[in-house]
Interface confidence: low
Amino acid sequence: DSSKWVFEHPETLYAWEGACVWIPCTYRALDGDLESFILFHNPEYNKNTSKFDGTRLYESTKDGKVPSEQKRVQFLGDKNKNCTLSIHPVHLNDSGQLGLRMESKTEKWMERIHLNVSERPFPPHIQLPPEIQESQEVTLTCLLNFSCYGYPIQLQWLLEGVPMRQAAVTSTSLTIKSVFTRSELKFSPQWSHHGKIVTCQLQDADGKFLSNDTVQLNVKHTPKLEIKVTPSDAIVREGDSVTMTCEVSSSNPEYTTVSWLKDGTSLKKQNTFTLNLREVTKDQSGKYCCQVSNDVGPGRSEEVFLQVQYAPEPSTVQILHSPAVEGSQVEFLCMSLANPLPTNYTWYHNGKEMQGRTEEKVHIPKILPWHAGTYSCVAENILGTGQRGPGAELDVQYPPKKVTTVIQNPMPIREGDTVTLSCNYNSSNPSVTRYEWKPHGAWEEPSLGVLKIQNVGWDNTTIACAACNSWCSWASPVALNVQYAPRDVRVRKIKPLSEIHSGNSVSLQCDFSSSHPKEVQFFWEKNGRLLGKESQLNFDSISPEDAGSYSCWVNNSIGQTASKAWTLEVLYAPRRLRVSMSPGDQVMEGKSATLTCESDANPPVSHYTWFDWNNQSLPYHSQKLRLEPVKVQHSGAYWCQGTNSVGKGRSPLSTLTVYYSPETIGRR
């Protein structure tokens, strides 16, 4: 039942004498394992015997394999799947049909495979893409319908007989679907490859030539051009003639149009291979080329730089940079169209030639105000000298110069005056637009550059102004030298260092912090009475009567200033003590009598002691001694003693007389 046998293998295999053939093959016998296999060469079915006749190249039975042809033919298969065969070496007479006779327990099958063995190695086949264009990458393929494990080969690419540098990728296939060896080469052909021969060479493992295939490359490219010019250096003078010729060295396909370009722009009505320029002008200087097109695109020649020589044109001056800041660097550039380029320059500043300046550029490293003005130049080349152009203006900017602060007032200035100052300067570029003053104050600027200080302070020492354009220039500070009456006048005790005691030597100093002018007079005053005109007031031996409120005055030509009143305090022991009696020195018994100890003391008495006519101290220590009720026995002389921090003082005796009351007398 034929439907039960399924085979897969290449339909035809190719080889040459002495090579080998590898036949990949698979099968499926559904009713069981293979029991017998015979490989026939050109089998033919014999109807009489119901068997196949032909040369048996290989045979295997249940009893085992039968060696045939000294192992030239090998069955590499198995009993149920693989039917791969190898013939090594293969001979010319192996060409024809191979018959695989397969038998299982119940089924038989003859499978036929074609074998084509040539006398010599057959050539590979080169495959090219349908169109090749310059600079576009293409893949060249070399295919050979042969591959065998026992016979290694190689494919090599040659261009005009020389091995190609590009790396080729070789692949082989030995499958039931196909058997081949393939080499692929990627490369980017140039226009110069057009018409060249490419060869794919088949070699054995040792590199020995076996066969080859060749193709001629058809590389499509834009026209390749050459330009020729007369005169050959393309340097002419105004009025001369110039001829340019365009030659096509290669074009595939043929060219269709011709044109000429100058500086990238097409020249009208110039559509031949020759360009004639008669009586050229300097405007015709530039880069020329010819352009020829074909179906691939336009091709351009190299550029020819036509130089039409002429004397320098009127020059202009470029300044980097104007306006310039004083002290900065400035560069002047003389610009003049000329061919050849000028070799010599003459520079002018405000119409006067600048000595030693012959270069295209003039560099001034440090600009000063006097550099300002008009700069012009003249350029010169081998054909002549140009004209002087209009020139360029250099504006040199600088801060205001020689700034001074000027006091407008008559001198001297007195405290409280209104002072007017002006800010003057010698020159400025750009113009002064504002002024600044130091120190800052809430002062008026009635007009630009004028400062008005109303009610000027005694301590306004110096003022400086700045005149400002883009920069500020400060003047040296000017001293206002404000005159004022003496300040901070005060009385200061020089001696003694501690408190003043009666009898001490005392010195008072009249101090002041400042005075302008310095020449001063002093006055001492107590209670409106003038005491002295020195800076010091001296007491050889101070008395309590000297205590009081003292002031000193200091005056100068501007005015006088008084100190605050200063209180002079004299400390002394209690004095002028006396005992006063109330209601009087004669009191009736039974009434009340108060004795008071009166004194003069600084500091006041802190402690009183009372004594009787026997100089006996009484147990009373307050200023008042109260006797209530008074008795006749209280009659007698009393005195008191006062004590302060300085010392003690005592009163004279004062007699108290206590007389009997009428009641007492009545009882007697």
Epitope: A442, W443, G457
Partner: antibody, heavy 116, light 108 residues
Framework: QVQLVQSGAEVKKPGASVKVSCKAS????????ISWVRQAPGQCLEWMGW????????SYAQKFQGRVTMTTDTSTGTAYMELRSLRSDDTAVYYC?????????WGQGTLVTVSS | EIVMTQSPATLSVSPGERATLSCRAS??????LAWYQQKPGQAPRLLIY???TRATGIPARFSGGGSGTEFTLTISSLQSEDFAVYYC??????????FGCGTKVEIK
């Protein structure tokens, strides 16, 4: 050295007034003006006005005209800024600065919070 | 009134990198421009006045430039203490002053 010391933080109700003081030392008070600048939380600096310590002349920002009064007391070297009819958006730190155009010396700032 | 516009509002920079802050005036203020630095909870600190003059005690890495209407503050190599808000202020119309709304320089 120059110092500007401002009064402490204040909490006010909407519609009330606040008076911030700025005591100057280390320089002649009369010779310089005082600028007032405020900064609401997370906001930009906002110039409010200027007063001359010399003659009391003032210049107020348009926004605060009629609501702000700036004064000085030359005897104590103190500048004052009073802001009336307070609103919640007046909550800010108020700075005084010695005004020379470029404020080199600033007070430490006074936080005024306006909240009902 | 002269309006001062600062850009960008926020600038993220790594320590050691250069920072350039811009300030534009709505009309020319000549060179009468100051730059301040303000850190949270502190009063502004003067960095630059006169557009390009460093105030006393300000490190040389801070530099100011420009005049007229376009100004820049450049911090050549940012230190950790430089991360703050920077304000420009014109005093061309002194005593009337106007401030920009600030550029916050933050750590990248």
């Amino acid at each position: 050295q120059v110092q500007l010391v401002q009064s402490g933080a204040e909490v006010k109700k909407p519609g009330a007034s606040v008076k911030v003081s700025c005591k100057a030392s280390g320089y002649t008070f009369n010779n310089y003006g005082i600028s007032w600048v405020r900064q609401a939380p997370g906001q930009c600096l906002e110039w409010m006005g200027w007063i001359s310590a010399y003659n009391g002349k003032t210049s107020y920002a348009q926004k605060f005209q009629g609501r702000v009064t700036m004064t000085t007391d030359t005897s104590t070297g103190t500048a004052y800024m009073e802001l009336r009819s307070l609103r919640s958006d007046d909550t800010a730190v108020y700075y005084c600065a010695r005004s020379t155009g470029d404020g080199e010396y600033w007070g430490q700032g006074t936080l005024v919070t306006v909240s009902s | 009134e002269i309006v001062m516009t600062q850009s960008p509002a926020t600038l993220s920079v790594s320590p050691g990198e250069r920072a350039t802050l811009s300030c534009r005036a709505s009309q020319s203020v000549s060179s009468n421009l100051a730059w301040y630095q303000q850190k949270p909870g502190q009063a502004p600190r003067l960095l630059i006045y006169g557009a390009s003059t460093r105030a006393t005690g300000i490190p040389a890495r801070f530099s100011g430039g420009g005049s007229g209407t376009e100004f820049t503050l450049t911090i050549s190599s940012l230190q950790s203490e430089d991360f703050a808000v920077y304000y420009c202020q014109q005093y061309h119309t002194w005593p009337v002053l106007t401030f920009g709304c600030g550029t916050k320089v933050e750590i990248k």
